[in-house]
Interface confidence: medium
Amino acid sequence: DAHKSEVAHRFKDLGEENFKALVLIAFAQYLQQCPFEDHVKLVNEVTEFAKTCVADESAENCDKSLHTLFGDKLCTVATLRETYGEMADCCAKQEPERNECFLQHKDDNPNLPRLVRPEVDVMCTAFHDNEETFLKKYLYEIARRHPYFYAPELLFFAKRYKAAFTECCQAADKAACLLPKLDELRDEGKASSAKQRLKCASLQKFGERAFKAWAVARLSQRFPKAEFAEVSKLVTDLTKVHTECCHGDLLECADDRADLAKYICENQDSISSKLKECCEKPLLEKSHCIAEVENDEMPADLPSLAADFVESKDVCKNYAEAKDVFLGMFLYEYARRHPDYSVVLLLRLAKTYETTLEKCCAAADPHECYAKVFDEFKPLVEEPQNLIKQNCELFEQLGEYKFQNALLVRYTKKVPQVSTPTLVEVSRNLGKVGSKCCKHPEAKRMPCAEDYLSVVLNQLCVLHEKTPVSDRVTKCCTESLVNRRPCFSALEVDETYVPKEFNAETFTFHADICTLSEKERQIKKQTALVELVKHKPKATKEQLKAVMDDFAAFVEKCCKADDKETCFAEEGKKLVAASQAALGL
């Protein structure tokens, strides 16, 4: 339904508070370097303008598109060229090219200072002094660091952030109450950002068909009792929501997400028996809850899959009549029967099925040709199962930190050209698959592990895309979305890599390491490990373990010393010399 004024329509639908929050998120995700105060000023101007349009939809400029209105506003920033360089050229373009230009300049790794958490009393004072500004600052800081964060979900995070401060700033022990909640929000926020980043990459790099296939598989696993037509409707709506959010259309996205939640709750009887509790919650909680809802039970007595997709003489006829619908039905039927498979595995099976039909439906005897198609699935299913079994065994043997180190070595040898911070970040996250998924029973391990790995490897892909240094990474990232993980798993040691020159400075440590948190200290040690492998890619596991054990002992010894700095200087030289000898550096 067409509205005379799109901005008035969204303002009325969302309400002033959500409207302002979403515009702030949108602006911060586009202009990631702009000061907070500048963004607040722009948001207030847009809000005042929106109010004039609500009062009179025929008022001047109220008929303009949101992209035009927001783009015009962003292009008024005085320091655009000095701060953003060539992004300023976007302002010379017309819509829709201007918005596309802004989107292309979103930076997944902006050069922003690390967020340092102030003392609890300082935060509580700031919260009480000006709650509105405090919460806006949260939205701003998260949005600019995570330019693809799912905006309506960020509103949900902000609501929880506010609730944490409201409760804990009155508590007897403010820190004990607040800090665990903030840690949880930080960790959940990073995970949410990474999951959404994969959805946007899927849409932007591989197209709508790829995203829809992913959504069919996931929703069919989650709602196995729903009819195919119902799943298809949900997929269409969900695709629209994520296309909008990934495209910077945050007001439309939040509005459509609310509509989708409403539809799901109104039709839960034909969707899933697990939605009841979610649907009793307020909007933001409801949408979050639906997105995380557990899989419904599989219907009893599902008919034979083979009958329609292998044994039927009409397979080629049905396929030719509507290829994507037939493949969608195959994916739906397979996924609803297999909550134990990862979504990416289901998509690989559907791709194999499609390839077989393409070949067989042109053959002399199509039925004879595709009769054994399920046999082709066997190696595809075995591969992730075996990989997960081996890696969970390794994780259980080593524990998370040492498991991360094993992955650091493995991935540095595969792609040594990738920057050390990226290798550390990605390998640490890959290593978290152990504690996240290995505790699950067999039936839940693969969907947990492989779909999580897809999210983490996408982080590698988007960070590498910004500064490409490895053809092997580019190849694994761009050839096939569903085969990224098998592609990286299959990479062996890069024999073409010329080892990095030894630089003693890289391995020089100071007393400041002693005051770091356990996590930060681990990152320091893991950074050294990556550099070690880059210098000596042929080093054995045993050699690297010996050097790392020596390094850990060195840090422990010097942190206990009276004169820490002297200890680090003197013992550090000895350690470097011993390591060089051990590794032949």
């Epitope: 599989m298 009893a300 007595d301 599902l302 008919p303 034979s304 899959l305 083979a306 009958a307 292998v310 044994e311 029967r337 297999h338 909550p339 134990d340 498979y341 009769a371 399920f374 046999d375 699935f377 066997k378 299913v381 075995e382 199962q385 039936a443």
Partner: nanobody
Framework: QVQLQESGGGLVQPGGSLRLSCAAS????????IAWFRQAPGKDLEGVSC????????NYADSVKGRFTISRDNAKNTVYLQMNKLKPEETAVYYC????????????????WGQGTQVTVSS
């Protein structure tokens, strides 16, 4: 080599129970759907029940629903058919058969078959 071996058949009174086992050797059942068929003297082969490789999807002939239960233990490489409230007309040779991943609609689509085990329901 690849083999399926049924066991657990025998003579049982009407209303009684039996538990049939289908053990695989030479291959792992993890990637196979297992079906039970039966053939009464002078009758056609009839599908009784099937369980997909994941164990999630199970199918039963209308005549046995609520009385028969199919289950699998992949660690033991074995599939079971628990038969309760047996009727005289269910006297037959019971066979198990395997096909990759999913249950099939036709007996001819199964790749591997056992030799069968005799079930006799009589007083």
């Amino acid at each position: 080599q690849v083999q399926l071996q049924e066991s657990g058949g025998g003579l049982v009174q009407p209303g009684g129970s039996l538990r049939l086992s289908c053990a695989a050797s030479g291959f792992t059942l993890d990637y196979y759907a297992i079906a039970w068929f039966r053939q009464a003297p002078g009758k056609d082969l009839e599908g009784v029940s099937c369980i997909a490789s994941s164990g999630g999807a199970t199918n039963y002939a209308d005549s046995v629903k609520g009385r028969f239960t199919i289950s699998r233990d992949n660690a033991k490489n074995t599939v079971y058919l628990q038969m309760n409230k047996l009727k005289p007309e269910e006297t037959a040779v019971y066979y198990c058969a395997a096909a990759t991943f999913e249950c099939r609609g036709r007996s001819s689509s199964y790749d591997y078959w056992g030799q069968g085990t005799q079930v006799t329901v009589s007083s």
